[in-house]
């Protein structure tokens, strides 16, 4: 074992070290004092440090672990981070195309459908895009609401012309009657299924997305306990009032401190593990009515098929409905 | 795997799809972020020796310091000394994560859950849960994958999926398409004139 | 122009299954929905059911619910009618047809399938 | 169900002549229905949909009318190519329903 240094020896090496830290030169002894008052480098002998400066270390150790810990999961943050950001921004492209589309095809298609349509399917992609950033919004009201909304203006507009401008209680009528016929036969609920499953798997994506950012967050931001700064101090910087400035930390002496430091810090790991496995099996199912891109994209074409199935069925739906709503339409007439 | 509205309108002027070199799809990004974050997977584990690999340690000096004096780097004093008469590394231990750390425990907990409820489970991507009438008519037989079910691969995989991120330039114009529905069909076929 | 080609004959032994296909071609497959008709030799026709190819969405005659089931693959534009448990009254042509898109009558027709189940 | 009754079940008649089918719903259609022709070991072709509106290419010689239950395709100057089976199909709403065929035979 190396002796230590001789007590005649200064503490010019350790104060311009020190310096580094803290401008001011007032807190290094000129020469090795007992340091009878230290309380994390308890010397073997005289001793470069003061209280002053042992507590200076402790601040200085415990900055540079944050800084550790912030480099460290400077990658895995930014990842994430990224990542959160361009889904969302994906899925409001893809919920903006989906709404497109659907006007597209009222526009080509139901051309005398367009005004109200484009209304309807409007607020249906706004709270479809609601539902994703998390809004609480029941999917199969929004569905409910589309096919509410859309009926009666196809009833008056494409299946029954003839009836003067719609008023409110005829249009109330055929919203009641929408959902007790099942005018538009099972596609309603195809739908919401199809939108419910992939919104809700979109949803749940986005908010892990956005958690594993509050993660790293909370752990970057950790502020380590004072048992904690007194290790690190012990490990990086008590060897400075021994004048021994070049010297290292044993590695395994690196790891006991920071795995004291991190027991905290290193519970998550379970958890976190867990967290990507879980995501991993949530992605491998998003496809087919699981995937949101799929559903949304495609939804232009079951809304489609579900007024051709409405006009198909014209005849016998215009005579229920003819019998069901008689009082409204009478009252319009008058 | 989406469909486009080409589909429904022959003319193909009515969808531009801006090309993109890389046509990565949602999926493919998707699968690609957990890949990257499987690299992490040990990530919390593995902090303790990262901050050491990235802290000054000693690798090939003969001598190390040990919290108390400088010793051989393989000696049994290396690890075990420094942590002589110190403040107990077990208490340290034993006191349990902050708060801050127990909350977003109980966070990553939550979220599993979500996430092992809202996973598809293997073989059953649809679920045998349509099987409303539609309006007096027959629909979804008793044994059937929805209602939509059952051509097995060939099911949504038409068309390629929206050009990651590629913004799609979509004509509205009417203009372009050639006739509609509401008039493509048989040209006396204005359902409204069957109730005269 | 519209064509429908359906699949060969098909001899099977009671209680076995069939599966028919019908091809599109000539228009976009997923605009139109496509039904099923049976056709006894020398009687009349009986509609069994329709496919919307886009959304696979099907629509049964109450009569053909278990007997039949009607699938899609968009990607070759072929329409698919299973028939199970198969009985001698199982023999028959089946057409599959093209409706209009917004009434139920058949512009275009296949060739049909003889199916004749024996022992 | 809707019930379609066809009537008469087989009728001869000669090129020239002047034919009418006619067709019984058992509720009322208003003029949701349709007539096919169909020749032995072909498919059947779509004549008439709406009760009175002529499908592409099919002659003028053929045509519908009647609505309610009461439904009628008469063919006028029979052509030799007319002769076959003919089928009234109501197209109101599912299940849909065919009648039991008219044959039409050469005299």
């Known amino acids: 074992q190396p002796p230590p240094p001789p007590p005649d020896a200064t503490c010019h090496q350790v104060r311009s070290f020190f310096q580094r830290l803290q401008p001011g030169l007032k807190w290094v002894p000129e020469t090795p004092v007992p340091g009878s008052d230290l309380q994390v480098c308890l010397p073997k002998g005289p001793t470069c440090c003061s209280r002053k400066m042992e507590e200076k270390y402790q601040l200085t150790a415990r900055l540079n672990m944050e800084q550790l810990l912030q480099s460290a999961s400077m990658e895995l943050k930014f990842l994430i981070i990224q990542n959160a950001a361009v889904f969302q921004e994906a899925f409001e492209i893809v919920v903006r195309h989906a709404k497109n589309y659907t006007n597209a095809m009222f526009k080509n298609n139901y051309p005398s459908l367009t005004p109200q349509a484009f209304e309807f399917v409007g607020e249906f992609f706004t709270d479809v895009s609601l539902y994703i950033l998390g809004s609480d919004i029941n999917v199969d009201d929004m569905v409910n609401e589309l096919f509410d909304s859309l009926f009666p203006v196809i009833y008056t507009q494409l299946m029954n012309p003839g009836l003067p401008d719609s008023a409110l209680d005829i249009n109330e009528c055929l919203r009641g009657a929408r959902r007790d016929l099942k005018v538009f036969g099972n596609f309603p609920k195809l739908i919401m299924t199809q939108v419910s499953k992939s919104l809700q798997v979109t949803r749940i994506f986005l908010q892990a997305l956005n958690l594993g950012i509050e993660v790293i967050n909370t752990t970057d931001h950790l502020k380590f306990s004072k048992d904690c700064g007194r290790m690190l101090t012990r490990m990086w910087y008590c060897s400075y009032c021994q004048g021994l400035m070049m010297v290292k930390p044993c590695g395994g002496y690196c790891n006991v401190v920071m795995q004291g430091c991190m027991a905290g810090v290193v519970e998550i790991d379970k958890y976190w593990r867990e967290y990507i496995l879980s995501l991993e099996e949530l992605v491998n199912g998003m496809y087919r009515i699981y995937d949101m891109e799929n559903v949304l994209l495609g939804l232009f074409s079951t809304i489609h098929d579900s007024i051709q199935y409405v006009q198909k069925n014209a005849g016998k739906l215009t005579t229920t409905i003819g019998k069901l709503c008689a009082h409204s339409q009478q009252r319009q007439y008058r | 795997s989406a469909y486009y509205p080409e589909d429904l309108f022959i003319d193909k002027k009515v969808l531009k799809v801006a090309h993109v070199e890389h046509e990565e799809t949602l999926s493919s990004r998707r699968r690609e972020l957990i890949q990257k974050l499987k690299s992490f997977i040990s990530f919390y584990s593995a902090l303790p020796g990262y901050i050491c690999s990235h802290s000054p340690v000693a690798e090939n000096d003969t001598l190390c310091w040990n919290g108390q004096e400088l010793v051989e780097r393989y000696s049994q004093k290396a690890a075990r000394n420094g942590m002589k008469n110190q403040f107990n590394l077990h208490e340290l231990k034993m006191k349990g994560p902050e708060p801050v750390v127990s909350q977003i425990i109980d966070k990553l907990k939550h979220i599993n859950q979500l996430l092992r409820t809202m996973s598809v489970p293997k073989g059953r991507v649809l679920d045998k849960n349509l099987d409303e009438e539609g309006f007096e008519s027959g629909d979804c037989g008793d044994d059937e994958d929805e209602c939509i079910g059952g051509s097995g691969d060939g099911m949504m995989k038409v068309k390629n999926q929206l050009r990651f991120l590629a913004e799609l330039a979509y004509d509205l114009d009417v203009d372009d398409v050639p006739g509609n529905n509401q008039q493509a069909t048989p040209k006396d076929n204005e359902i409204s004139t069957f109730h005269n | 122009q519209v064509q429908l080609q359906q699949s060969g004959a098909e001899l099977a032994r009671p209680g076995a299954s069939v599966k028919l296909s019908c091809k599109a071609s000539?228009?976009?497959?997923?605009?139109?929905?496509i039904s099923w008709v049976k056709q006894i030799t020398g009687q009349g026709l009986e509609w069994i059911g329709e496919?919307?190819?886009?959304?696979?969405?099907?629509y049964y005659n109450e009569k053909f619910k278990g007997k039949a089931t009607l699938t899609a693959d968009k990607s070759s534009s072929t329409a698919y009618m299973e028939l199970r448990s198969l009985t001698s009254e199982d023999s028959a042509v089946y057409f599959c047809?093209?409706?209009?898109?917004?009434?139920?009558?058949?512009?275009?027709w296949g060739q049909g399938t003889l199916v004749t189940v024996s022992a | 169900d809707i019930q379609m009754t066809q009537s008469p079940a087989s009728l001869s008649a000669s090129v020239g002549e002047t034919v009418t089918i006619t067709c019984r719903t058992s509720e009322n259609i208003y003029s949701y229905l349709a007539w096919y022709q169909q020749k032995q070991g072909k498919s059947p072709q779509l004549l008439v949909y709406?009760?009175?509106t002529l499908a592409e290419g099919v002659p003028s010689r053929f045509s519908g009318s009647g609505s309610g239950t009461q439904f009628s395709l008469k063919i006028n100057s029979l052509q030799p190519e007319d002769f076959g089976s003919y089928y009234c199909q109501h197209h109101y709403g599912t299940p849909l329903t065919f009648g039991a065929g008219t044959k039409l035979e050469l005299k």
């Open positions: 047809a093209r409706d209009y898109g917004n009434i139920y009558s058949f512009a275009y």
């Open positions: 000539g228009y976009t497959f997923t605009s139109y929905g």
């Open positions: 496919i919307y190819p886009r959304s696979e969405s099907t």
């Open positions: 709406n009760a009175k």
